[in-house]
């Protein structure tokens, strides 16, 4: 039974050229967690394996940054960047828990970070 | 080519035991996850088991767990099956499947092999 | 464990038509879904993942749908190489389980 709770760092915004991390954290179970997924819509942005560590997707090479802990940080952010973002732990044996934040990327420099908010 | 051939299969009485093997070729052997599935004859498939990439975590079906053990041996892109205990039940053909890079799903299967458990 | 029924468990087409084969799971499984293609004596090819992506080299022709309980496999302007039996599969939590397959027989 699917028993835990991710927290996500839930709607952001951040400034044009800047960066912004992503977190996510699984709480309330006792699953294995053997793989974290970063996605955009239905685009892979990383993978942080339990075994193997990260692995960055070649197209976000030079945009993405693992890190820190499963977060995954965003750099040199333009507007085209505004939209959902998925963190997927893979776990044994619930399965798949799913977070989502929404980024939105401003022109000007009056980013402010959102509250935190838990998804069930 | 992506290629998983699995052997080993055969005859055995209940209650013996078994060693299926699946090697690889063509990709990176180390980096994938990958999995046992079985099909019993006109029953749909089943899956067995899944070990990670470096073989730190194996898991199983309530099915077959305490009595088949998932190992591999990444220096030689091989997977492995130990079958112990066997039962009727267990008479399938078993497949090797790789699980995808990003974990949904299992991408690239071999033909499989039969094992059959009668006495 | 999620149960998957799978319907119909045979359908009759001609190349050229379109087909749809259906999977339900008995509790909510999200977008995870996976399509499988089997012909006799061959291995399992995978076909479509996360309810919706086509898996690389597969034809378009192909599309999944679905979310929660309810998917679709849709196989438009079938092939004569399309005939073969479909299996879907849920990867949302273990253990893994598949549907009874579907066959894809010409009429």
């Known amino acids: 039974m699917m028993t835990g709770t991710i927290e996500t760092t839930g709607n952001i915004s951040a400034e044009k050229g800047g960066s912004i991390i992503l977190q996510c954290h699984l709480s309330s179970t006792t699953a294995q967690v053997t793989q974290v997924n970063w996605e955009q819509q239905d685009q892979l942005l990383a993978i942080c394996n339990a075994d193997l560590g990260w692995h960055i997707s070649p197209s976000f090479k030079d945009r993405v940054a693992p890190g820190p802990g499963l977060g995954l940080t965003l750099q040199s952010l333009t507007v085209n960047d505004t939209g959902e973002y998925f963190c997927i732990y893979h776990t044994y044996p619930d399965g798949t828990y799913t977070g989502r934040i929404f980024l939105e990327v401003l022109e000007s420099s009056v980013a402010e970070h959102g509250a935190r908010f838990q998804i069930p | 080519e992506v290629q998983v051939v699995e052997s080993g299969g055969g005859l055995v009485k209940p209650g013996g035991s078994l060693r299926l093997s699946c090697a690889a070729s063509g990709f990176t052997f180390s980096t994938y996850a990958m999995s046992w599935v079985r099909q019993a004859p006109e029953q749909r498939l089943e899956w067995v088991a899944e070990i990670s990439s470096g073989g730190s975590h194996t898991f199983y079906a309530d099915t077959v767990k305490g009595r088949f053990t998932i190992s591999r041996d990444n220096a030689k892109n091989t997977l492995y099956l130990q079958m112990n205990s066997l039962r009727a039940e267990d008479t399938a053909v078993y497949y090797c499947?790789?699980?995808?890079?990003?974990?949904?799903?299992?991408?690239?299967w071999g033909q499989g092999t039969t094992v059959t458990v009668s006495s | 464990d999620v149960q998957i029924t799978q319907s119909p468990s045979s359908v009759s087409a001609s190349v050229g038509e379109t087909i749809t084969i259906n999977c339900r799971a008995s509790k909510s499984i999200s977008k995870y879904l996976a399509w499988y293609q089997q012909k006799p004596g061959k291995a399992p090819k995978l076909l479509i993942y996360s309810g919706s992506r086509l898996q690389s080299g597969v034809p378009s022709r192909f599309s999944g749908s679905g979310s929660g309980t309810d998917f679709t496999l849709t196989i438009s302007s079938l092939q004569p190489e399309d005939f073969a039996t479909y299996y879907c599969?849920?990867?949302?939590?273990?253990?893994?389980?598949f549907g009874g397959g579907t066959k894809l027989e010409i009429k």
């Open positions: 499947a790789r699980k995808t890079l990003d974990y949904y799903a299992l991408d690239y």
């Open positions: 599969q849920q990867h949302n939590e273990y253990p893994w389980t």
